[in-house]
């Protein structure tokens, strides 16, 4: 009996530019002789329904149809036909199929590969054209994929130490697509510093599919207006 097992759940998520290993494990009733078996990996794009051969292994020969694609002969001996793809790109997302032949038996499995890119986040203070006592804080998130992203603003005061979401005076712009397929977006918070307590901590909170925990950039309102430190003005996260 020959069986193939892919990633549990049928989906694998990988970061952009990573060296991804797409899992494919072989279960066979006898010890595997790699000289008399075949492995073929196929890829089907998200955008068109045509299947393309990525890698082929047959006995004493292997061929990569995607540069750098490889199945380890040394892992194959112990039933691991996983495909290594170095420097994975956004356009390589889609369905991957692992086909195993141990003559006369054949088994296959499929997995969906999702490629994600994590946003970098930075805070900027924009004072241009602002009225007296009025500040505009911009939270820029860049280089993320997929497009769906959630940016919120929170504040913590000495009176209320638990974060409170700010819903007023927040404008989040449209997402902009970059040349490399990733996205950027900017969210703005308008503040009237005369009405806010010094010592209040404001946070821009970015939630995205690529992040295990939200990305947080913060600044503290000081008694002297606009006295943000340079690092607070351009708080970089990756």
């Amino acid at each position: 009996d020959l069986k193939v097992e892919m990633m549990a759940g049928g989906t694998q998520i990988t970061p952009l530019n990573d060296n991804v290993t797409i899992f494919c494990n072989i279960f066979y009733s006898q010890p595997l002789n790699i000289t008399s078996m075949g492995i073929t990996w196929f890829w089907k794009s998200l955008t068109f329904d045509k299947e393309v051969k990525v890698f082929e292994f047959f006995g004493d020969h292997q061929e990569a149809f995607r540069p750098g694609a490889i199945v380890s002969p040394w892992r194959l001996k112990s039933g691991d036909a996983s495909l290594r793809l170095p420097g994975i790109q956004l356009e390589e997302a889609g369905e991957y199929r692992c086909e195993v032949v141990v003559t006369p038996l054949k088994a296959q499995g499929t997995v969906q590969l999702e490629v994600v890119a994590s946003p970098a986040s930075r805070l900027l203070l924009d004072q241009v054209g602002m009225k007296e006592n009025e500040d505009k804080y911009m939270c820029e998130s860049s280089g993320f994929y997929p497009e769906a992203i959630n940016i919120t603003w929170e504040k913590q005061t000495q009176k209320f130490p638990h974060p409170i979401e700010i819903s007023e005076d927040v404008i989040t712009g449209p997402t902009i697509k970059n040349m490399d397929g990733t996205f950027n977006v900017t969210s703005c918070l308008k503040l009237n510093s005369s009405q806010e307590d010094p010592g209040t901590v404001y946070q821009c909170v970015v939630r995205h599919a690529s992040l295990h925990t939200p990305l947080r950039s913060n600044f503290t309102l000081t008694a002297a207006r606009h006295s943000l430190s340079e690092t607070e003005k351009t708080d970089n996260f990756s």
Partner: antibody, heavy 120, light 111 residues
Framework: EVQLVQSGAEVKKPGASVKVSCKAS????????MDWVRQAPGQGLEWMGD????????LYNQKFRGRVTMTVDTSISTAYMELSRLRSDDTAVYYC?????????????WGQGTTVTVSS | DIVLTQTPLSLSVTPGQPASISCKAS??????????MNWYLQKPGQPPQLLIY???TLHSGVPDRFSGSGSGTDFTLKISRVEAEDVGVYYC?????????FGQGTKLEIK
């Protein structure tokens, strides 16, 4: 920085078992196999087998089959090698070594070694 | 099993002079155009360290005075100018077939 840190020296009686651990750090544990190699006093190197942390699959040197068990705990990036029914000629330094498996096959980083002495 | 025979088993070299070690395999260690032969150096009291893999590729951080050549069954490790720090035992290893086997070792000493 890639590091493989092995457990301390062991003294065992004939017929007993020994379990050596190898804690890996500085790289993605599942991207490489772990080889186990031993060296008897004043002797050369002998490959015992390897384990694939990706699926737990093992390849053992026929010489040790039935006596050796290699396992991994991916949650703590640690590989283990257990050798049972010890004999005096199992007295050796046991090494774990990180093994590249995609672009060739070679052991590029080695643990410091664990001395196992089998004596009655 | 593939048997690897190293020659010489020991050699004594004057610093600055070249050295050469041969490794012969009982059968070919080539597969799909590549040679699966590796070279290691074991310095006294230390674990082995990788010098060369795939017959001729220098491992990162290894001085370029070391070089490897050969294919099929005949392989050579060369040191263009031996230095005091090169003392130890040199092993060839094949990784084409299991069990992966080592040569018996060549001890390099400084004159």
């Amino acid at each position: 920085e890639v590091q493989l840190v092995q457990s301390g020296a062991e003294v065992k009686k004939p017929g007993a078992s020994v379990k050596v651990s190898c804690k890996a750090s500085g790289y993605t544990f599942t991207d490489y196999n772990m080889d186990w190699v031993r060296q008897a006093p004043g002797q050369g190197l002998e490959w015992m087998g390897d384990i694939n942390p990706n699926n737990g699959g093992t390849l053992y040197n026929q010489k040790f089959r039935g006596r050796v068990t290699m396992t991994v705990d991916t949650s703590i990036s640690t590989a283990y090698m257990e050798l049972s029914r010890l004999r005096s000629d199992d007295t050796a330094v046991y090494y774990c070594a990180r093994s590249e498996v995609f672009y060739g096959n070679y052991a590029d980083y080695w643990g410091q070694g664990t001395t196992v002495t089998v004596s009655s | 099993d593939i048997v690897l025979t190293q020659t010489p088993l020991s050699l004594s070299v004057t610093p600055g002079q070249p050295a050469s070690i041969s490794c012969k395999a009982s059968q070919s260690v080539d597969y799909d155009g590549d040679s699966y032969m590796n070279w290691y150096l074991q310095k006294p009291g230390q674990p082995p360290q990788l010098l060369i893999y795939a017959a001729s590729t220098l491992h990162s951080g290894v001085p370029d005075r070391f070089s490897g050549s050969g294919s099929g069954t005949d392989f050579t490790l060369k040191i263009s100018r031996v230095e005091a720090e090169d003392v130890g035992v040199y092993y060839c290893q094949q990784s084409k077939e299991d069990p992966r086997t080592f040569g018996q070792g060549t001890k390099l000493e400084i004159k």
